[in-house]
Interface confidence: low
Amino acid sequence: MNGRVDYLVTEEEINLTRGPSGLGFNIVGGTDQQYVSNDSGIYVSRIKENGAAALDGRLQEGDKILSVNGQDLKNLLHQDAVDLFRNAGYAVSLRVQHRLQVQNGPIGHRGEGDPSGIPIFMVLVPVFALTMVAAWAFMRYRQQL
């Protein structure tokens, strides 16, 4: 493992029909509450169980929503974006960016973590290695006493 992580970015048009509880997902982001460093885009933070988005199955937590019914979501306050979704009507067309993590072959969705964050294995591997070195040093030191 060389620690390198690549990202495969794909875009998709997703058409949702508003259900009894709305579109069935929560969003984060906006110019006043950036979810990703240097990116004021709108991201899906949670897919509600049995909601319209969950039943459709294509929208994923961590996806970036680029537009709603053709209206760009760039440079919007968070609440502006919320209002836009609330008033988008019954049939809603979303332009979505999926960011897939490609790590040594297998492709897995990033999920709900911070899309700009460090993948957890990059933290865990060095921590594990340090722990092993410390344990070995401790055992060796004990044997010398």
């Epitope: 760009d72 919007l76 306050l77 502006d80 209002d83 836009l84």
Partner: nanobody, 120 residues
Framework: DVQLVESGGGLVQPGGSLRLSCTAS????????MGWVRQAPGKGPEWVAT???????HYRNSVKGRFTISRDNAKNTLHLQMNSLKPEDTAVYYC???????????????RGQGTQVTVS
């Protein structure tokens, strides 16, 4: 003191057009969400259209494609171009200011006195 003054209402035949204007004083409209709400006789206030500080606009479904909201930052004026008017568009139209840059409020302190639009 914040003040909103609407103009441009009137009596028009079905299918006709009107252009409403709202002049704001006391703050720059470009830094807020601004919009229009309307109130028909005996009914509650109804949201019509919003323009955000970013320039993004959105409309209630029944007016989409017929109404266009815009603003003139230099003149600090908000406009609502209303085409293909229908009898159900009859109402008093109020210019409204967003609170914290977002939600439109219909309480007196957040809107103008209104301008009557009658489609008949």
């Amino acid at each position: 003191d914040v003040q909103l003054v609407e103009s441009g209402g009137g009596l028009v035949q079905p299918g006709g057009s009107l252009r409403l204007s709202c002049t704001a004083s006391g703050y720059p409209i470009s830094t807020y969400a601004m919009g229009w709400v309307r109130q028909a006789p005996g009914k509650g206030p109804e949201w019509v259209a919003t323009i955000y500080y970013s320039g993004v606009t959105h409309y209630r479904n029944s007016v989409k494609g017929r109404f266009t909201i815009s603003r003139d930052n230099a003149k600090n004026t908000l406009h609502l171009q209303m085409n293909s008017l229908k009898p159900e568009d009859t109402a008093v139209y109020y210019c409204a200011k967003g609170v914290n840059g977002t939600y439109l409020r219909v309480e007196a302190e957040y809107r103008g006195q209104g301008t009557q639009v009658t489609v008949s």
